[in-house]
């Protein structure tokens, strides 16, 4: 049994880091493998993660962490029984993938303005809470070419757009994702999408 693709890990900079790797053949990850992880610090504790299957030869492990600070560094040991398959380290602050925003809502009752709001996925006491910016994706269910991205570079989790910038009388969907420049994070996963019917009053034209 060998590791084909070494573990790569990302942290949500809150309580979970996710590590993925591939074995050289079909593997029952949860029964055959264990990923041990330990904070490199005085009197730290070794923890064991039981991986799950992620495709035939792929494994994924969710490492629980009580808290994350920028100096944290973890040792990682991948074991198959008594055999050490791989040894590495992981610094969560250097591999951050934020949590996905939630509760995306489209408010259509504001005079020909669409107000999209969502929730910041972090509690106020988390460092990332005040450092997230967002991308909102809006697309038409009828027209695949009608696909747009709005970058929200301010901290407020909301976006206002004129309803008239979208076509009237058709359904749209929206989703949102987040990233934090301070830690040069990757983008989060997209939030679940929300759907609405876009309709607005055409301006009265005088002839």
């Amino acid at each position: 049994m060998k590791v084909l693709q070494e573990p790569t890990c990302v942290s949500d900079y809150m309580s979970i880091s996710t590590c993925e790797w591939k074995m050289n053949g079909p593997t029952n990850c949860s029964t055959e493998l264990r990923l041990l992880y330990q904070l490199v610090f005085l009197l730290s504790e070794a923890h064991t993660c039981i991986p799950e299957n992620n495709g035939g030869a792929g494994c994924v492990c969710h490492l629980l962490m009580d808290d994350v600070v920028s100096a944290d560094n973890y040792t990682l040991d991948l074991w198959a029984g008594q055999q050490l398959l791989w040894k590495g380290s992981f610094k969560p602050s250097e591999h951050v993938k934020p949590r996905a925003p939630g509760n995306l809502t489209v408010h259509t009752n504001v005079s020909d303005t669409l107000l999209l709001t969502w929730s910041n996925p972090y509690p106020p006491d988390n460092y990332l809470y005040n450092h997230l910016t967002y991308a909102v994706n809006i697309w038409s269910e009828n027209d695949p070419a009608d696909f747009r991205i709005y970058n929200v570079t301010y901290l407020e989790p909301s976006l206002r757009i004129a309803a008239s910038t979208l076509k009237s009388g058709i359904s749209y969907r929206a989703r949102v994702r987040a990233w934090a420049q301070c830690y040069n994070t990757t983008w989060s996963e997209w939030s679940p999408s929300t759907k609405w019917h876009n309709s607005y009053r055409e301006p009265f034209e005088q002839h």
């Epitope: 330990q38 610090f41 005085l42 009197l43 730290s44 504790e45 009580d66 100096a71």
Partner: antibody, heavy 119, light 107 residues
Framework: QVQLQESGAELVKPGASVKMSCKAS????????MHWVKQTPGQGLEWIGG????????SYNQKFKGKATLTADKSSNTAYMQLSSLTSEDSAVYYC????????????WGQGTLVTVSA | DIQMTQTTSSLSASLGDRVTISCRAS??????LNWYQQKPDGTVKLLIY???RLHSGVPSRFSGSGSGTDYSLTISNLEQEDVATYFC?????????FGGGTKLEIK
């Protein structure tokens, strides 16, 4: 809410030993470290050392090696510190303080145990 | 050992004031700087850990900042219950060491 309950005040004679206790109201004692801190008017706060109750690992301030011995009883969520060969310099308030395992900040503190060394 | 210096041993301020308490380390401590509050009855509580992280249950009027060797604790809107002695502590290098404390009183 985590609470640490320390044993009561001690009046001991020079040359004797004293053993104080600290009981933690936590679910999994092994996920924490128990540290001990000395406070005197002259020296202020001094870190004595810490213990991982799960595996028994200890770390001591060199100044207190040979003076303090840290132990724990996992079954009762209780940590102990024994001080030996006591002198008047050991008269102080001693605090137990809990950290999450491998952390450098004392998240919860006991109320303190006053030790008075006097003939 | 790393020396932690709190140059102000005591200070007096009025209710509602913004108060800043400083702490200097004798060498770089890489943000491993924590702040504690000791009430007159001896009760000790963690306020801020790792320079600027607010411990759970601590009012948001407390904040911390700094880097390298210089750190500070700020109380933005002083209340009567903040009367206490405040200690800094470094957790970067063994042995972990504390500052001498700053006693805060109300004018």
């Amino acid at each position: 809410q985590v609470q640490l309950q320390e044993s009561g005040a001690e009046l001991v004679k020079p040359g004797a030993s004293v053993k104080m206790s600290c009981k933690a109201s936590v679910n999994t004692f092994t996920g924490y470290n128990m540290h001990w801190v000395k406070q005197t008017p002259g020296q202020g706060l001094e870190w004595i050392g810490g213990l991982h109750p799960g595996n028994g690992d200890t770390s001591y301030n060199q100044k207190f090696k040979g003076k303090a011995t840290l132990t724990a009883d996992k079954s009762s969520n209780t940590a102990y510190m024994q001080l030996s060969s006591l002198t008047s310099e050991d008269s102080a308030v001693y605090y137990c303080a809990l950290t999450t395992a491998g952390r450098a900040w004392f998240a919860y503190w006991g109320q303190g145990t006053l030790v008075t060394v006097s003939a | 050992d790393i020396q932690m210096t709190q140059t102000t041993s005591s200070l007096s301020a009025s209710l509602g004031d913004r108060v800043t308490i400083s702490c200097r380390a004798s060498q770089d401590i890489s943000n491993y700087l924590n702040w504690y509050q000791q009430k007159p009855d001896g009760t000790v509580k963690l306020l801020i850990y790792y320079t600027s992280r607010l411990h759970s249950g601590v009012p948001s009027r407390f904040s911390g900042s700094g880097s390298g060797t210089d750190y500070s604790l700020t109380i933005s809107n002083l209340e009567q219950e903040d009367v206490a002695t405040y200690f800094c502590q470094q957790g970067n290098t063994l042995p972990w060491t504390f500052g001498g404390g700053t006693k805060l009183e109300i004018k």
